[in-house]
Interface confidence: medium
């Protein structure tokens, strides 16, 4: 008789999860010479140890500490790009502007990007059928706790001017419940961070509104100002042109507003 298994509301662990994490670790350490010392076997063991045999609604940041320690990485603290609900453009940007970094450009972010994982209490099995959904099941699930942990550490490391890319097409351009709004904003260190500069990305070709005046952006400005950090905001009216101008800043069309 098959053993009873908890049914969660979210999708199960990504297929070939161990292989994917290990292959990504190898690839990352090959591409980034400064991370060549990393032992990917130990990284996988620490990753696995964070959630295997544990109840997937009872995961803590403490569970991920061995992994955090192994994945310790120094990125230039003044070259950090945060993002909310606009991951693809943020990643396209850092692929071109190679000296800036999103969380997914770091080892730990790269390992887990777009993956889902969870285990089962008291068994060494990975659950490929279902995993807890943040809203419908529980917030202390392996994936949510991982991203909360790495996002907090990433924000804590930032200094000088920190940039954040926000999606101007969404009803809430700044969402207090996003990882950026609930974790990163509150973990920027006022002693180190002088300014948070928001880049609001417009979706429509003909959208000429000043989205920096949006009520949610004003809310972000208020939160940031109360934390003793300056705030600035820019509209990116033409994201395609914006990327093009990052690639070719000498282009004559790049002197006008983008």
């Amino acid at each position: 008789v098959p053993r009873w298994r908890q049914q969660w509301s979210g999708p199960g662990t990504t297929k070939r999860f161990p292989e994917t994490v290990l292959a990504r670790c190898v690839k990352y350490t090959e591409i980034h010479p400064e991370m060549r010392h990393v032992d990917c076997q130990s990284v996988w063991d620490a990753f696995k140890g964070a959630f295997i045999s544990k109840h997937p609604c009872n995961i803590t940041e403490e569970d991920y500490q061995p992994l955090m320690k192994l994945g310790t990485q120094t990125v230039p603290c003044n070259k950090i790009l945060l993002w909310s609900r606009i991951k693809d453009l943020a990643h396209q940007f850092t692929q071109v502007q190679r000296d800036m970094f999103t969380l997914e450009d770091t080892l730990l972010g790269y390992l887990a990007d777009d993956l889902t994982w969870c285990g089962e209490f008291n068994t060494s099995k990975i659950n490929y059928q279902s995993c807890p959904d943040w809203r419908k099941d529980c917030s202390n699930n392996p994936v949510s706790v991982f991203w909360k942990t790495v996002s907090r550490r990433f924000a804590e490391a930032a200094c000088d001017v920190v940039h954040v890319m926000l999606n101007g097409s969404r009803s809430k351009i700044f969402d207090k419940n996003s990882t950026f709004g609930s974790v990163e904003v509150h973990n920027l260190q006022p002693e180190k961070v002088q300014t948070l500069e928001a880049w609001v990305i417009h979706g429509g070709r003909e959208d000429s509104r000043d989205l920096c005046q949006d009520p949610t952006i004003k809310e972000l400005e208020s939160i940031i100002s109360k934390r003793n950090i300056q705030f600035s905001c820019k509209n990116i009216y033409r994201p395609d042109k914006f990327l093009q101008c990052v690639k070719n800043p000498e282009d004559s069309s790049c002197t006008s507003e983008i």
């Epitope: 994917t20 190898v26 690839k27 010479p33 032992d39 990917c40």
Partner: antibody, heavy 120, light 107 residues
Framework: QVQLVQSGAEVKKPGSSVKVSCKAS????????ISWVRQAPGQGLEWMGR????????NYAQKFQGRVTITADESTSTAYMELSSLRSEDTAVYYC?????????????WGQGTLVTVSS | EIVMTQSPATLSVSPGERATLSCRAS??????LAWYQQKPGQAPRLLIY???TRATGIPARFSGSGSGTEFTLTISSLQSEDFAVYYC?????????FGQGTKVEIK
């Protein structure tokens, strides 16, 4: 005990191709990176390229680009190195090697080598 | 491509003596350097990785040092089984490249 066992010696004509196999035992094959290194008689070691079996990702030295194909078959835990358009200078011992702890940079475990002789 | 240059090409040493082998990279490879030992008719054997970390089972008489472009492999007291060819290899940049080797022979 992890081992890499390679196929036997080959004698080939110039212009033909050779495919050398490397079977892994005693470890989780798919997540270890397999590199190929060759050594001409009396000469030094030359890195040719590598494969990550779980993804099929490859990387080749420029010198061999277009002539070498490195593949892996997870079902049989075997990696392959195929070299085409053979010339006499390709006469060498070909080694497969594996990194320590999933890593490909330093090569901790080596196959016994396969001698490929190219002669008309 | 990073060129690795080893010196000397041949080193004649008496058993019990110290041997010092050098390896120079044409550009910085940080600490991403390995050393191998190869005996005739055998596959290479990993001695050192990360410029200074001894591989599993390698005797303490083998030590590596250096970073950037200059590296050294030291064998503190040569045993008869240490007479072989030694290669350095960088894994900082594609393609990984080896030095041409240093032959350590009995004086």
């Amino acid at each position: 005990q992890v081992q890499l066992v390679q196929s036997g010696a080959e004698v080939k004509k110039p212009g033909s191709s050779v495919k050398v196999s490397c079977k892994a035992s005693g470890g989780e094959f798919s997540i270890y990176v397999i590199s190929w290194v060759r050594q001409a008689p009396g000469q030094g070691l030359e890195w040719m390229g590598r494969v990550i079996p779980s993804t099929g990702d490859t990387n080749y030295a420029q010198k061999f680009q277009g002539r070498v194909t490195i593949t892996a078959d997870e079902s049989t835990s075997t990696a392959y190195m195929e070299l085409s358009s053979l010339r006499s200078e390709d006469t060498a011992v070909y080694y497969c090697a594996r990194g320590k702890a999933y890593y490909s940079g330093w090569l901790a475990i080596w196959g016994q080598g396969t001698l490929v002789t190219v002669s008309s | 491509e990073i060129v690795m240059t080893q010196s000397p090409a041949t080193l004649s040493v008496s058993p019990g003596e110290r041997a010092t082998l050098s390896c120079r990279a044409s550009q910085s490879v940080s600490s991403n350097l390995a050393w191998y030992q190869q005996k005739p008719g055998q596959a290479p054997r990993l001695l050192i990785y990360g410029a200074s970390t001894r591989a599993t089972g390698i005797p303490a008489r083998f030590s590596g040092s250096g970073s950037g472009t200059e590296f050294t492999l030291t064998i503190s007291s040569l045993q008869s089984e240490d007479f072989a060819v030694y290669y350095c290899q960088q894994y900082n940049n594609w393609p990984w490249t080896f030095g041409q080797g240093t032959k350590v022979e009995i004086k």
